[in-house]
């Protein structure tokens, strides 16, 4: 008996049988700027992290995953000025005394070397220079993600 | 209500040092970041250092790098500024200000503190 | 380093008239500009912050306007206890800087 997990992996699996992928040419919304396969918009206002959260959402997106130490550094790049923090999407977990990402996954102890504690109602934050664990109530800047997904064309199958 | 209260100025030789504080009460201090500004007798204000609310994240301005120290401790809500190689041109009011981040403005201000570099 | 300037250095006025201050960026620092003020012997007072956005309890005869490089700072009508030196500070980039000030003098 496969998980209801498995069993949408396996549905999607055998869609994707049924299309061709070609490159997507698909554009970042205005303001947002595209960064590889994602689109991210840094904001210009303050928030703590819950209402940075809740910002993405109301937008389509969510915090800024990162994946490893190369995408750290290319977004790292994007930020103008060592005084300025943004929120990511990465809190620390209390129940399993871990950095959990918002998609549900554990940070991978190798990808980000944070300063700082981790506690409770921590946070991470990211600057031009680093990746901090700052209070979660702490008002910074927040960066959003859109993930760009290539076009599909269907192909039907011959009768 | 919130508050700022600087002590530790003084009267300090060239080369001498000094260590200011500023009790912080009325707010969360951990969540937020502080600074120090400075304003010289009958001068303008100069901003000096900055620090994140974790104390993580230190920023300085050029005149005082190398020499100045900012740290925090937010278990007794306190900010401090270790002023190490003092010159006669840091002679000033020192106040510590709610803010730090950019782009933050300095929303609280303490009532400040005298330091005096003389021989 | 972004340098802010401001005009005029002083100026005199009355009871009741209408001042402006102005303030001047080396570069364009978008919205990110404050104003304070402060008089003799006290901490600098919070007035505006992100060059219109007036700060809780101020009075509401205080105006900021402007963005990018030329910004304002409007008293509609002078009161005595508005006496005293102003700053436009940009929070756009480090180092943070002040301008020169305005001192608000009696005519």
């Known amino acids: 008996q496969k998980s209801s997990i498995e069993k949408c992996s396996v549905d999607i699996q055998q869609s994707r049988n049924k299309t061709t992928e070609r490159p997507g040419l698909l554009n970042c919304p205005i303001y947002w700027q595209q960064l590889r396969e994602k689109c991210l918009l840094f904001s210009h206002t303050v928030n703590p992290w819950n209402n940075s959260l809740a910002d993405c959402s109301t937008k389509e997106s969510s915090l800024l995953l990162i994946r490893d130490k190369d995408e750290l550094i290319h977004t790292q790049n994007l930020i103008r000025d060592k005084a300025i923090l943004f929120w990511i999407g990465l809190n620390f977990s209390l129940s399993e005394k871990n950095w959990k990402w918002i998609n549900g996954s554990f940070l991978n102890s190798n990808d980000l070397e944070i300063r700082g504690d981790a506690k409770e109602n921590s946070c991470i934050s990211i600057s031009q220079t680093s990746v901090y664990s700052e209070y979660c109530s702490t008002e910074i800047r927040w960066i959003c993600q859109k993930e760009l997904t290539p076009v599909r064309n269907k192909v039907y199958p011959d009768s | 209500e919130v508050q700022l209260v600087e002590s530790g100025g003084g009267l300090v030789q060239p080369g001498g040092s000094l260590r200011l504080s500023c009790a912080a009460s009325?707010?969360?201090?951990?969540?937020?970041?502080m600074s120090w500004v400075r304003q010289a007798p009958g001068k303008g204000l100069e901003w000096v250092s900055a620090?994140?609310?974790?104390?993580?994240?230190?920023y300085y301005a050029d005149s005082v790098k190398g020499r100045f120290t900012i740290s925090r401790d937010n278990s007794k809500n306190t900010l401090y500024l270790q002023m190490n190689s003092l010159r006669a041109e840091d002679t000033a009011v020192y106040y510590c200000?709610?803010?730090?981040?950019?782009?933050?403005?300095?929303?609280?201000w303490g009532q400040g503190t005298l330091v005096t570099v003389s021989s | 380093d972004i340098q802010m300037t401001q005009s005029p250095s002083s100026l005199s006025a009355s009871v009741g008239d209408r001042v402006t201050i102005t303030c001047r960026a080396s570069?364009?620092?978008?919205?990110?500009l404050n104003w304070y003020q402060q008089k003799p012997g006290k901490a600098p007072k919070l007035l505006i912050y992100?060059?219109?956005s007036l700060q809780s309890g101020v009075p509401s005869r205080f105006s900021g306007s402007g963005s990018g490089t030329d910004f304002a700072l409007t008293i509609s009508s002078l009161q005595p206890e508005d006496f005293a030196t102003y700053y436009c500070?940009?929070?756009?980039?480090?180092?943070?800087?002040f301008g020169q000030g305005t001192k608000v003098e009696i005519k």
């Open positions: 200000a709610r803010g730090g981040y950019l782009p933050d403005a300095f929303d609280y």
């Open positions: 992100a060059a219109s």
């Open positions: 009325g707010f969360t201090f951990s969540s937020y970041a």
């Open positions: 500070q940009q929070t756009y980039s480090t180092p943070l800087t």
């Open positions: 570069q364009s620092i978008s919205s990110y």
């Open positions: 620090i994140s609310g974790s104390g993580g994240s230190t």
